[in-house]
């Protein structure tokens, strides 16, 4: 059903990293425009991206209101220049997205090793606590603020001169690892939410090696 030459959106896909959340869909419009609605299970639909020719809509502002809720979005198609027109049943064509629960599904962004400090045979490695777009009391929360102990970091480290990797884990943003004195090490970090069934791990942070500018060394 639907107005002639108006087609329903398809391939609705959530793209979300650290709660920055965009809905994408197809097709590129020809003589039509789109409006997006989003709702939790309450059915209180909120319209966004009115009469757009884009095939994406930033829904971050809506999902950060409660990242533990499950959201559904729907994309309505209207004839360009005649947005009051509806389908043959008196309803505009629309398609639903998959369900999306940000807390369970947003991708974990690539972490950054903020600093490392060697004291004797110990190295303290700190992973940057990235800011998200989730707010509380007018302040942006960090990834750790949002996920708490659900979020761990894994550190992979190795002697610069070899390839055999060791691992360490922390449920804070800091590692304290044992190293050999006078030996240079390289490392990268990965964010992990072990309780998840999808999107459990981030991509790896950039590799950092001792002797580079982020490091500090004390005997």
């Amino acid at each position: 059903s639907g107005t002639t030459n108006t087609v329903a959106a398809y391939n609705l896909t959530w793209k979300s990293t650290n709660f920055k959340t965009i809905l994408e869909w197809e097709p590129k419009p020809v003589n039509q425009v789109y409006t997006v609605q989003i709702s939790t299970k309450s059915g209180d639909w909120k319209s966004k991206c009115f009469y757009t020719t884009d095939t994406e809509c930033d829904l971050t502002d809506e999902i950060v209101k409660d990242v533990k809720q499950t959201y559904l979005a729907r994309v309505f198609s209207y004839p360009a220049g005649n947005v009051e027109s509806t389908g043959s049943a008196g309803e505009p064509l629309y398609e639903n997205s998959p369900e999306f629960t940000p807390y369970l599904e947003t991708n974990l962004g690539q972490p950054t090793i903020q600093s490392f400090e060697q004291v004797g045979t110990k190295v303290n490695v700190t992973v940057e606590d990235e800011r998200t777009l989730v707010r509380r009391n007018n302040t942006f929360l960090s990834l750790r603020d949002v996920f708490g102990k659900d979020l761990i970091y894994t550190l992979y480290y190795w002697k610069s001169s070899s390839s055999g990797k060791k691992t360490a884990k922390t449920n804070t943003n800091e590692f304290l690892i044992d190293v050999e004195k006078g030996v240079s090490y390289c490392f990268f970090a990965q964010a992990v939410i072990p309780s998840r069934t999808v999107n459990r791990k981030s991509t790896d942070s950039p590799v950092e090696c001792m002797g580079q500018e982020k490091g500090e060394f004390r005997e």
Partner: antibody, heavy 118, light 107 residues
């Protein structure tokens, strides 16, 4: 466990009124749209009305528009259906149901019988 | 209003049988369709939503398929507790409408 318990049904004369209630428990009531569905004796299911979690959006089947009013009190976890100007054809078991996104009906009450007869 | 037509209206089968019930919408509803099971004197129970998504707690012998106007509910191996009446429902647009039901009886 989700529980929905309807009450308020009974025998009423044509032209009369009844208010049905549905007490909800086991979930965050305000987070869900809710619906009323009815079933006349020996017949199939008929969707009657739906309301969004905030109560801001309400929807009705044509045959009850202007006669029935759906409402909710989120502080009491209760859904209502005010039925006025009742007709014989409104005789049915009325079910309250939870309705994610105001779409399908994932949990149902046990129903309450409304009989409209003189 | 969108009309929902189920077939067959009634069906006799035996435990262990594979059973298919169909539902046809009078116009395209994408995959906005649900299936319910109702036993005598009981409230309906949700089985399937979004045409093919299994409701939590429903046995995997139940499955749904279809999109647009034609949909099916399949029970892969009938169990004694599956004898009941089955309804489809569209939630594409208001007023939401149900099929007239398919009564599944023991042969």
């Amino acid at each position: 466990e989700v529980q929905l318990l309807e009450s308020g049904g009974g025998l009423v004369q044509p032209g009369g009124s009844l208010r049905l209630s549905c007490a909800a428990s086991g979930f965050t009531f305000s987070n869900y749209a809710m619906s009323w569905v009815r079933q006349a004796p020996g017949k199939g299911l008929e969707w009657v009305s739906s309301i969004s979690g905030s109560g801001d959006y309400t929807y009705y089947t044509d045959s009850v528009k202007g006669r029935f009013t759906i409402s909710r009190d989120n502080s009491k976890n209760t859904l209502y259906l005010q039925m006025n100007s009742l007709r014989a054809e409104d005789t049915a078991v009325y079910y309250c149901a939870r309705s994610p996104w105001g779409y399908y009906l994932d949990s149902w009450g046990q129903g309450t019988l409304v009989t409209v007869s003189s | 209003d969108i009309q929902m037509t189920q077939s067959p209206p009634s069906l006799s089968a035996s435990a262990g049988d594979r059973v298919t019930i169909t539902c046809r919408a009078s116009q395209g509803i994408s995959s906005r369709l649900a299936w319910y099971q109702q036993k005598p004197e009981k409230a309906p129970k949700s089985l399937i939503y979004a045409a093919s998504s299994l409701q939590s707690g429903v046995p995997s012998r139940f499955s749904g398929s279809g999109s647009g106007t034609d949909f099916t509910l399949t029970i892969s191996s009938l169990q004694p507790e599956d004898f009941a009446t089955y309804y489809c429902q569209q939630y594409n647009s208001y007023p939401y409408t149900f099929g007239q039901g398919t009564k599944l009886e023991i042969k």
